[in-house]
Interface confidence: low
Amino acid sequence: EAIQVTQPSVVLASSHGVASFPCEYSPSHNTDEVRVTVLRQTNDQMTEVCATTFTEKNTVGFLDYPFCSGTFNESRVNLTIQGLRAVDTGLYLCKVELMYPPPYFVGMGNGTQIYVIDPEPCPDSDF
């Protein structure tokens, strides 16, 4: 079964290398367990950045991942990726799986292009 996953097309990371964006799905289902995976697409390969499972009791995710955090509310996940550098610029896709109870639903967003600009080094100053 399919669900529609929406995410912003472009996000600019902060100067500290932090990018935040929402990942929403519809239609909303009464689901006990929602699996959210952030994937990075490079050429024809997908690489998992982080993944977590949200439940009614567990609405804060990605505890296993130092660079990812997220909160879940109804059919919206607010995702934050930290520690980004210019080389991490790329397309990040949000995959949502409604794991339980059956039926299984799955959907993939079109991706969020995250742009990361490394901060200019502070010039030396004489005091």
Epitope: M46, T53, K57, E97, M99, F105, V106, G107, M108
Partner: antibody, heavy 116, light 111 residues
């Protein structure tokens, strides 16, 4: 850090029951995922046996469904495997594993020999 | 049950060379909604438990080196430049349907 640890007798007599436990640390087994038992026979063949879901439902491999039971103790964050009427064909290394489609965390395995 | 057939059963490769392992399923593993195949790859080093390498046929699990590559079309696992530490058994596994089933495994040896 999530860890799974199997424990149980290394030797079981034919026709008896085999009981194994899996202790999970770093994640509550009632918070999510399926909690699985998988075994690997001496010839390296791997067989998925079944799981208990985080909310308590179970699903077993039909090939051994009549002989196995998977239960849990949420207060100890453990889940268990019982295999009845064992034969020498049940000699294997038994693993517990966490699953959401794929098995991302495994225990180190416990070797069980069925022999008289 | 879905049968998973792996080939070859063993493979001997020199360090730095490419290794390719094939997995065939007795029926389609493609989920049209997910637009992906429900196939996973694991490696098992001597004396250790299996470890997840790739899921959805081509998505590398966190921390897996990019020399490991899964094809989403023909179910092959390629190690682009084999390292000594890649000595292991490799297994494919389907989760398209219950019961989950594994291939018989491919033993990769280093020459």
């Amino acid at each position: 850090q999530i860890q799974l640890q199997e424990s149980g007798p290394g030797l079981v007599n034919p026709s008896q029951s085999l009981s194994l436990s899996c202790s999970v640390t770093g994640y509550s087994i009632t918070s999510g995922y399926g909690w699985n038992w998988i075994r690997q026979f001496p010839g390296q063949k791997v067989e998925w046996m079944g799981f208990i879901y985080y909310e308590g439902s179970t699903y077993y491999n039909p090939s051994i469904k009549s002989r196995i039971s998977i239960t849990r103790d949420t207060s100890k964050n453990q889940f268990f495997l019982q295999v009845n009427s064992v034969t020498t064909e049940d000699t294997a290394t038994y693993y517990c594993a966490r699953q959401t489609g794929y098995f991302d965390y495994w225990g180190q395995g416990t070797m069980v020999t069925v022999s008289s | 049950d879905i049968m998973m057939t792996q080939s070859p059963s063993s493979l001997s490769v020199s360090a730095g060379e490419k290794a390719t392992i094939s997995c065939k399923s007795s029926q389609s593993l493609f989920n049209s909604n997910a637009k992906t195949n429900y196939l996973n790859w694991y490696l098992q080093k001597p004396g250790q438990s299996p470890k997840l390498l790739i899921y959805y046929a081509s998505t590398r699990h966190t921390g897996v080196p990019d020399r490991f590559r899964g094809s989403g079309t023909d179910f092959t696992l390629t190690i682009s430049s084999v390292q000594d530490e890649d000595l292991a058994f490799y297994y494919c596994q389907q989760w398209y349907d219950y019961p989950y089933t594994f291939g018989a495994g491919t033993k990769v040896e280093i020459k």
